[in-house]
Structures are given as C-alpha cells and as structure tokens.
C-alpha cells in the first residue's frame, strides 16, 4: 500500500507563438482544478478505461479575473498535493492522465459551469520511495509543469511497497536473514511468509499466508500449469488432477463495490458502476456535491447542493457513467472502411488507414482509377490492386506530369543515334540500317526489308517517329 503524489507547479501558455487566450475574463471570472487518473502498466489504454490505480480531484484554485490587454500568465493554482492512494503493490510502470478543468463563476443559471481546458497523458516508469520526478507536458498552446512520486505507507517498503517493516525486537540487530529497513534503520524487514508450499517460481503473495498465481499457473500452491483443453465440464475437473483451469474467485466475488455499486468483470480486473452520489474505483468516495465538480467530460451537474442530496451528471453525447467518466465504444460499429483502424478520441472518431486508402473513413481507394487524372493525355490502367498511368509520348512519372527523355530507353537499334524532338524522338541510323527505330537492315543489293522507303527518304536518312 502507498500513495502516489502529484504536485502541480504551473499551468499557463507554452513557449512559441500562438499564446492561448486567458480562460477567464472580467465578465466571467474562473478558477482551475485538476484531475489525475492512474492506470497500471505502459499500455496505450483509451482515456475512458477505468483508472484502475486510482484517481483524485484537486481543490479549487483561487478565483482569477483576466486583466484586459494582458497576456495570459501562469494561472493561479490550487493549494496542496493531489494524492492517489493505492492498496496493492505499486506496479513500477504506470500511465497517467492529468486534466485541467475550468470552473466559471459568472451568473450561470444553475450554478457554476465546468469545462475541460487541457488533457495531458503519458506513460512512465517509477520506483516507489524514489525522489520527486519532474515533468513538463504540453496540450495545444498550454503547458503543464508538475512533479510526482510514489511513496509507501508503513509498514510497507521497497520499490513496489510489497516488503513489510516492523519495529526491532532487539535494539542492536535484526533477526536472522532480515535486513534493516532503509531508510527506517531502526526497523527491520518483516518476513513476508506466503502460504506453506507456495511455488517460489509461479506464485507470490502480497499478504502473509496467501498464494497468488502468475498467469499460466493455477492450483492452491500455483504448481499446476493451466490447460484449457480436456476439461470434462465447463468448469472442468479438479485442477489438482488435470491442470484444467478452474475459475477461482472472480474479481467481482463478494462485490468489491461499496455503497450499492454494481460490479462487472473486465479482462484485467473489475469495474464498478456507482449509484448517484458516489464515485471512485470502488464507489468509496461519497459526500460529493456539484460544487466538487464530479461530472467529467463536460457533463452537467444537477442537484447535490449539500452532501446529503445526490447529484446527477447529465452527460454529453458519447459519454456515460455516473460521472460521465466513460466513453461509449463507438468503434464497435466499425465505421472505418477497408480495414482502417478506429480510434475514438472522444471529441471525434479517427481512422488510421491502411496503405493505399485515404479519407476520414478510409473511403478513398488511392489504388484505383476512379477520379484519377493522368496528366498530358495519359490514360489510367488498373491492375493487381494498383493503378498506373500510361503516359503519352514525351511524358512520364506517376501522373504523367514529368517531361520524359524519349531517348532514355535507348530506342534506336543497331547503333542508331537518338535525338529528342518536340514531337517525340528521331533515330539517325548507322549505315546499313533503316526504319523508325533503325530496326530493318538494308540489303546489299539496295533493297530493304521494308516494302519501300517512304517517299523522300533514302536509306540511312534519319527516320522521324511520329
């Protein structure tokens, strides 16, 4: 167990041109607050996936009113740290989302209004117990400077907060095999005793007496490799005998969601759908009012004037959840064509197109002749899933826009010399050859392989190819 701590140092215009307009004005004074969302691992998770490591909301910053004509300065910040407690081991690698929200304090009907100013995200490696790490992130024209660290809560210590410390029983030294607990030298590392017989290779424990299995292993002591085949029934026979995967306690067993929240299993863990008035990973955060700004992603908060009355978040299209924190999976309708990859960014859908396709939904096939213009009289030829332009004489390139060197392909046979000409090319044939490409030998008796030389041309004269 431990706490992730985030300290916001500044939020203001970033360097470079195009400074953002101040988010507040004399007519609409405002104040800032921040939200942080943490997820384990380095995976590129969508913004709406649960904050499995936890989330936190800052206090409100001081009220700010823009000075007319002045550039937007760094905006006044809330006091204090954002703290995200974690109950289990610190994962070492994590993803974060930090949102900067603006609360407008003008004469809005129904109280203050919230809007998202900036969202930054990143993936980092961090050992618990280490020093503060500094970071700068940019979102559009805004820049956010912050520091963060993870620290263990006693008695946990170590880079993952999994080792336990206990006060020394003897003043001088720790017991056999136990080290002093740096930095708490007056304490000793407590042995973390897993269940007797728990496999040291395939099992581990975070609490004394338990035996949790690594992926691919099962059984009470994590000694049985998982095999999903040869099960006699959907649940399979005893894992101890066959190694069949017997579902152990599911993540929703015993319902980890507090305050009447409903639990649904996810591929990695579980997710709680909280009743109104509660939020957090396990619906454990309560007493929230609209003044706390519980509705994310532009949701409108109604009711909840005091902690005893529940608030309701009216979510904008595309968002859901009791706090509008979850995005509807629009990509499930597969709007991207031609094998494009769908990305739901919240404010818009984006398609990452496969090679050869373009357009907002990958609807334009770049490899066909439909709507394809070949310049300078060229014609489009399809074939093999690709297209090419067959160019008129004197032109080349993908779209026939380049002037071609007609002599580049050495078209004149038998040593004939090629001359470029505005209407094409001309071959000056070597003695003994004739024809537009010098392809015909002149017979010794003066007769040619051609029926007759064109009028006005003698064998050996340059032959113009039109």
């Amino acid at each position: 167990a431990g706490v992730f701590e985030l300290q916001i140092h500044s939020f203001g215009p970033g360097p470079g041109p195009g400074a953002p307009r101040s988010p507040c004005s004399a007519r609409l004074p405002c104040r800032l607050f921040f939200r942080v969302c943490l997820k384990p691992g380095l995976s590129e998770e969508a913004a709406e996936s649960p904050c499995a490591l936890g989330a936190a909301l800052s206090a409100r910053g001081p009220v700010y009113t823009e000075q007319p004509g002045a550039p937007a300065p760094d905006l006044p910040l809330p006091d204090g740290l954002l703290q995200v407690p974690f109950r289990d081991a610190w994962p070492g690698t994590f993803s974060f989302i930090i949102e900067t929200w603006r609360e407008e304090l003008g004469d809005q009907i129904g109280g203050p209004a919230w809007s998202l100013l900036a969202r930054v995200a990143g993936r980092r490696r961090l050992a618990a117990g280490g020093p503060w790490a500094r970071d700068i992130q940019r979102a559009g024209a805004w820049e956010l400077r912050f520091s963060y660290r993870a620290r263990c809560e006693p008695p946990a210590v170590g880079t993952a907060c999994t080792r336990l410390c206990r006060p020394r029983s003897a003043p001088s030294r720790c017991g056999p095999g136990l080290r002093p607990c740096a930095p708490l030298e007056d304490e000793c590392e407590a042995p973390l005793v897993c269940r007797a017989g728990c496999s040291p290779e395939h099992g581990f424990c975070e609490q004394p007496g338990e035996c949790r299995c690594l992926e691919g292993w099962t059984g009470p002591l994590c000694t049985v490799p998982v095999s999903t085949s040869s099960c006699l029934s959907p649940r399979g026979p005893s894992s101890a005998t066959t190694g069949c995967l017997v579902p152990g306690p599911g993540p929703c067993d015993g319902n980890p969601c507090a305050n009447g929240g409903s639990c649904s299993e996810t591929p990695r863990s579980f997710e709680c759908t909280c009743p109104r008035g509660f939020y957090g990973l396990r619906c454990e955060v309560s007493g929230v009012t609209c003044a706390d700004g519980p509705c994310f992603n532009g949701g409108l908060c109604v009711g909840g004037a005091d902690p005893d009355s529940a608030y309701i978040c009216h979510c904008p299209p595309g968002f859901q959840g009791s706090n509008c924190e979850k995005r509807v999976d629009r990509c499930s309708l597969q709007p991207c064509r031609n094998g494009g990859l769908c990305l739901d960014l919240g404010h818009a859908l984006r398609c990452r197109c496969r090679a050869g396709f373009a357009g907002p939904r990958c609807e334009h096939d770049l490899d066909d002749c439909a709507g394809r213009a070949c310049a300078n009289g060229g014609t489009c030829v399809e074939g093999g899933g690709a297209h090419r332009c067959s160019c008129a004489l004197g032109f080349g390139g993908r779209d026939c826009r380049e002037r071609a060197d007609p002599c580049a392909a050495r078209p004149c046979a038998h040593g004939g010399r090629c001359y470029a000409h505005f209407s094409g090319l001309v071959c000056a044939c070597a003695p003994g050859y004739m024809g537009a490409r010098c392809e015909f030998p002149v017979h010794p008796d003066g007769a040619s392989a051609l029926p007759a030389a064109p009028p006005g041309l003698r064998p050996g004269d340059p032959q113009r190819y039109l």
């Epitope: 629009r330 597969q334 709007p335 991207c336 064509r337 494009g340 907002p360 939904r361 990958c362 609807e363």
Partner: nanobody, 120 residues
Framework: EVQLVESGGGEVQPGGSLRLSCAAS????????MGWYRQAPGKQRELVAG???????KYAESVKGRFTISRDNAKNTVYLQMSSLRAEDTAVYYC??????????????WGQGTLVTVKP
C-alpha cells in the same frame, strides 16, 4: 446538422416482438455506418446491431438469431426487428449514425433513445 428520430419502443411480454425504426434527416451527403446501441439501467451502452462502414451487418452475440437489422437507403432509415424478446433486452435503445455531411467531413450522431421494456 443531422437528426436521428427513433420510434417503435414500448412494453412487450417475454417471447414477443417489436420493430424499431430510426430515420436520419438533415444535411446528409451519405451515411457511412448506422446501427443500434442499448443501455440498461446501471450498465454500459453497448452495440446491438448495425451496418459497418464497409456495409457489413454486425450483431452482438446476445441477440444473434433473434434480432435482424435492415435498411432503406432511399429513406435514410434503419430498422431493428426484435423477436423472442427476453427480460434482459429491457433497455433504452439508441440509434447511432456516422454521417458524411459533405465529401470530406464526417460526424457521429445519436438519437434521443426509445425505451423497450420486456416484462411478464
């Protein structure tokens, strides 16, 4: 702007049938993808059935063989024929459409939803 108007919801007994309609209107250049999502109380909004961007039909596993989606391109309308209805099909059904408003601009639109209640 594009509007999606759903109709056909109501209350029905288990095993019964309903037909939902969704008509798109407004500044439509072409409809890229269109379908039905549903949201039961306390649950996530999920895709029920739809026509993908490539024109294929797609169904949620839980409704395969019971629900059929169809469309009338001339009317910019999709239909969801629901039969063998079960209590777990109770939800608000939302129409969704991914619409080109001109050749190079596309946006996602939701309808207001129509309630389907299945109870004995």
């Amino acid at each position: 702007e594009v509007q999606l108007v759903e109709s056909g919801g109501g209350e029905v007994q288990p095993g019964g049938s309903l037909r939902l309609s969704c008509a798109a209107s407004g500044s439509i250049f072409s409809i890229n993808a269109m379908g039905w999502y549903r949201q039961a109380p306390g649950k996530q909004r999920e895709l029920v059935a739809g026509f993908t961007g490539d024109g294929m039909t797609k169904y949620a596993e839980s409704v395969k063989g019971r629900f059929t989606i169809s469309r009338d391109n001339a009317k910019n309308t999709v239909y969801l024929q629901m039969s063998s209805l079960r209590a777990e099909d109770t939800a608000v059904y939302y129409c969704a459409a991914d619409v080109f408003t001109d050749r190079d601009h596309v946006d996602w639109y939701w309808g207001q939803g129509t309630l389907v209640t299945v109870k004995p």
